[in-house]
Each structure stands twice: as C-alpha cells, then as structure tokens.
C-alpha cells in the first residue's frame, strides 16, 4: 500500500525553541516514522533536519539547528515504513518573522504596601532576540487574589514597582513581553502571587518635590513623625531600562545623608545633565521605613521650566488667553520640547475668590465673566509626566477689563 504524505504541518517558534507538529495522513497504518529535510534560500540541495529524523510521534524539535533567524527556509516531510511517501513541502518562512516571544521570567519582592517586579526574558542569551534584547517592554495584569478585579499596566521595563497596595494581602500577576519595533506581543508568564508584609511601623516619606534656589537644588518631602533622620539616594533613570541589570546601584546624595529635617539642599553641580530617580527613607534609630515612591528628576526641566507668557483678548463675557513660550533674557523664546499643561487662575480685581482652569491647549477661553469688570489672570506650567511632577512658578498677574455688554461675538 502506498504511504500518504503527512499533512497540515505547523511550525511553532517560541524564543529559540523550534517545534514542528503535523497530522498523520493514515491512522490505520502502524509503525510509521517521519523525517524532515530543510533548504535554505538560494540553495538547491535539501539537507536532513537534525532532531527530526525517523520520528515516531507527530512532533519534533529542531532547536539545535543553528539557523540564521533572518533567512528564509523551506521544510519538507515524508512518511516512512518499508517504503516512503512522497514529500510534502511546507510553505517557506523566516524564523524571526514567525517567532513568538516566550513567557518572561518574573521575580517578586514584597513590602507592606508595594511589590517590586523584576522581569527578564524567558530565554537567556536568546539567539532569536539577540539584536532586540534592549527593546523589550513588558505589560502586566495584576489583581487581588480575593477579588479578581484586574488592573493592566502597560509599557514597563525590567524592574517595576507597584505602590499603594494593602498590607497583608495576596496579589497575583502575570507578565508578557513585547517588541514594539517588530509588532510582536509575547505569551503571558505563569501567574505569580505574593503576599504584602504586615504594615511597617514607619511609613515611607511622601510628596517629594525638587525646586531650584540660586545654585542649589532643594529637595522637600512630608513625614508623619518628628525626630527622624532621612537619607536620599539617586539613580540614573536609564538604568531601569537595562534588562540584564538586577543590581541597581543607588547612590547617596552626600548633603542628604542622615538629615534631621524634611528637606535637604545640595549644589546643582552634584548632578550632570540628565534624568535621575530620587528616593527618600526615614529612620528613627531603631526602625527604618521602606523607600518612598521614586520620583523622576530631569535637570533640564528642573532648571528651565519657566512660567508661561500669555496675551489676553478681552470680550464682554470672556477672556481669550493665548499662551506662548516663555522668554529668556534677551527676549528669545525658550523651546520646551516636553508636553505641558497650563494652570490658569483668575479673579475679579475687587475680590479674593479665585477660579482655576487646567488646559493642555495654548488657547484658552475663560468664560462667564461680567462686562466692564477688571479681572486678573496668572498662569503656571506643569509637566504632564506624573513622575516628573514639576511645576513652574506663577507668571506675574495681568489685569484686564472686560468689554461692554454687546461685544461677546
């Protein structure tokens, strides 16, 4: 009896694992084995596919074959008993294009109200992703074990910390990788669960802010208790993106080590131009708090987030405000190439009651004004990145009178 060729061959590639699956064409014929050949682009000859010769099952692994993952290859399969079937050719494919990103490795650390997630590629020193290893981003789904309500967090790097959790609570999460440059989304990791610790005696410092005074940075934070000492550490922000890095070498700010106030002052030249992360820890001599939430600190923005400049066009019942770039000395506009939101405060000149508008646009309408009334306006800029959390000082107030009642159009 003639053997039929196997059919429906599927190639599954996850990271560096190459798996072939196929269907037997004739279930009634026993003791059949299967063999594959492969052919590289531009070659005429077929080569035996090692790991996939004389296979009795309908699955084989050819991960040991050292292929150029960017080069197209073609496969063929046949069945063998006393005789052989004809070859069945599989559509040619490029391994890299076909490959899926496997589940990442996940390691969790617990604090009382936070979880630290360390993520690394599932396959160490992967050949498939050798050129893309630095481009991995991750997303995760996290939920309280007791409730199952899921929260998604996108675009995180190899270390991520989730804050504002409840003590002594089990949280579960799963993580997947993505290579946005290649439009690839990976497979979720297994679910990992961890229980946050009992509440720490000392809470971490909160509301960390950096401002500039003269040639110094002033770092301020809030703390619940008195008679504490604090230390402040910094880290280059880009190090968080380094996938091979499990040790973050946070450094002390010398003038902010063992300070007894909820602020410290240090010279601007401590930091070269760049983006840093800052964190603060409290201690009472016996106990130490967990570290505060990390804030992002950009020396450029810190030094140069200037108040906005604006013009007012007065109507009878509204102001139209046009916000422009702030001016440096010499009247040249400052290019601020990061997204800002504007906070506009206005009030009737004869009153203290302030009203506020928050706008992303640079042309803003202040509505519901009374005709022939003097109103004053001041504005400031905020960075839109929640981690930078930087604000300019307010501009000087500008006061204008609204037009008479019939000029609202």
């Amino acid at each position: 009896k003639n053997l039929k060729s196997p059919q429906k061959v599927e190639v599954d590639i996850i990271d560096d694992n190459f798996i072939l699956r196929w269907n037997r064409s004739d279930e009634s014929v026993g003791n059949v084995t299967f063999s594959f050949d492969y052919q590289k682009t531009g070659m005429d000859n077929w080569i035996k596919l090692s790991g996939c010769q004389n296979i009795t099952s309908t699955k084989c692994n050819f991960s040991s074959l050292k292929l150029n993952v960017y080069e197209e290859i073609k496969l063929r399969i046949r069945a063998e008993k006393e005789n052989t079937s004809s070859w069945y050719e599989v559509d040619s494919f490029t391994p890299f294009r076909k490959a899926q990103i496997g589940p990442p490795e996940v390691h969790l650390e617990a604090e009382d109200k936070a979880i630290v997630i360390h993520i690394s590629p599932g396959t160490k020193d992967s050949v498939m992703w050798a050129l893309d290893g630095l481009s991995f981003t991750y997303s995760l789904v996290i939920w309280k074990n007791s409730s199952g309500v899921e929260e998604r967090i996108e675009n995180i790097y190899s270390r991520h910390k989730i804050y504002k959790l409840s003590p002594e609570t089990t949280y579960c999460l799963k993580v997947k990788a993505a290579l946005l440059t290649s439009w690839k989304i990976g497979v979720y990791s297994p679910v990992h669960c961890i229980k946050t610790t009992v509440e720490n005696e000392l809470p971490p410092p909160e509301n960390i802010e950096v401002s500039v005074q003269n040639q110094n940075y002033v770092l301020k934070w809030d703390y619940t208790y008195a008679n504490m000492t604090f230390q402040v550490q910094w880290l280059h922000a880009f190090l968080k993106r380094n996938p091979g890095n499990h040790l973050y070498k946070w450094k002390q700010i010398p003038d902010c080590e063992n300070v007894k106030t909820t602020q410290c002052v240090f010279p601007q030249n401590v930091f070269q131009k760049g983006i840093y992360l800052l964190r603060v820890q409290a201690s009472d001599g016996n106990n130490t708090s967990f570290w505060s939430e990390e804030i992002k600190f950009d020396t450029e923005i810190q030094a140069f987030l200037l108040p906005p400049v604006f013009n007012i066009r007065s109507l009878s019942d509204s102001f139209h405000i046009y916000i422009g770039a702030p001016k440096q000395s010499g009247n040249t506009p400052v290019i601020q190439d990061y997204p800002l939101i504007y906070e506009i405060i206005f009030w009737e000149n004869t009153s203290n009651a302030e009203r506020k508008i928050i706008e992303k646009k640079t042309d803003v309408t202040v509505p519901n004004l009374k005709p022939l009334t003097v109103y004053c306006v001041k504005a400031r800029a905020h960075t839109m990145d929640e981690k930078l959390n930087k604000s300019s000082v307010f501009s000087d107030a500008v006061c204008e009178k609204t037009k008479p009642g019939n000029t609202s159009k």
Epitope: L108, E109, D112, V116, H118, E201, K249, N287
Partner: antibody, heavy 118, light 107 residues
Framework: QVQLVQSGAEVKKPGASVKLSCKGS????????IHWVKQAPGQGLEWIGR????????KYAPKFQGRATITADTSISTAYLELSRLRSDDTVVYYC???????????WGQGTLVTVSS | DIQMTQSPSSLSTSVGDRVTVTCKTS??????VAWYQQKPGKAPKPLIY???YRYSGVPSRFSGSGSGTDFTLTISSVQPEDFATYYC?????????FGPGTKLDIK
Amino acid sequence: QVQLVQSGAEVKKPGASVKLSCKGSGFNIKDYYIHWVKQAPGQGLEWIGRIDPEDAETKYAPKFQGRATITADTSISTAYLELSRLRSDDTVVYYCGRYHGYWALDYWGQGTLVTVSS
Amino acid sequence: DIQMTQSPSSLSTSVGDRVTVTCKTSQNVGTNVAWYQQKPGKAPKPLIYSTSYRYSGVPSRFSGSGSGTDFTLTISSVQPEDFATYYCHQYFSYPYTFGPGTKLDIK
C-alpha cells in the same frame, strides 16, 4: 564560570595590619558589590562591609568602621580588605562574596584564615 | 542594626524527616532574606534568596517562606548531605546581619 578566589592564610602579630584579596572571574566586577564577612572559629557569620568597585563607594558595619578598609582594583578584578591594629580576637576566617541585588550573596570565596598571635 | 534570631539553635534529626528552621528579624525587612548552608571548613553555600527563591542547582526539598519579620526554611525530607549549619541573612538595610545559625545533626 563565576569564581571568587581569595588569598592564602596569614599569620600576624597583634597591632599589625593585614591586607586580604579576593579575585573575581567569569563576571565583570564593576557590575556587582563585593562584600566581606568574618567568621570566628565555631561562631556565626558577621558582616564587615562592602564596596562598589565601579566607583569605590563603601559601607561598613559600625563595629568595623575605622579599622577595616575595603578597596578594589577593577583592572585586575580584585577587591581587598585591610584590617589594622590586629588583636587576638581577629583570628578568624574572612570571606568575600558577590552581591547581586535581590539575589543577595550568590557567590562566595573559599575564605582566608588570619591568625593573630604573638 | 536589625537583630536576627534563629530557632532552634541546634536540631537532631534523621534522614527522611521534615525540618523547619525559623528566623525572626527585629523589624520589617520585606522579603529581603536569604538562607545559606555551611559545612565545617567550607564557605557558606547559597540556598534561598528573596525569602522563597531557590538558587540554581539547589534541590527542591529546600524551600523558604515568610515575609516582614518571620521567615522559615524547610527541608521536606532531610538527606545525609544536609547535615550542616544554616544561617539566615537580611539584606534590607545596612549594616547587613546574619542569624546566629541552626546546627542540624544526625539523631
């Protein structure tokens, strides 16, 4: 493979100093911290301090501050522990260990026995 | 400094027994605890890091659990090569500290 190889046993007189070495191989010493731990005969482990070989930043246990000095030479992948004003209770084994963030001390040297005797 | 206590200080057991060693810290250290095994004349051998993760090559009979101030090392079925001293270690804040050790010997 990753290894930490420590210098050989030392015999010193009280009041003298000793400098021990710990050579790393199979990894870049600049990417880690190197810690030093002491162990008296039949006793437990006691942390002395650590160095960041990349910039020579050090931390010490208060007990050893001023008497222990940890240094590193990244060009030869080696960290050092120098102990001054040796006393007879410094007759212990000193271990170096590689610190790898949440992996803690994942590799240790074989230990160096220092004997202080007059 | 963070103080660490370990119990028991010594334990006589037989091959095949299940053994539990506990470690208490004087303050919350999150999950920053490691466990090491040491045999006479040898360097400590890393067993568990970050409270519950086994180092590569460590047999699955060793497991760690706990968080905050209370930590446990469990050997599910003691083997002849497990008779040694076990130390816990906190690496939450400086100065780092070790527990006094638990000596496991043959009954």
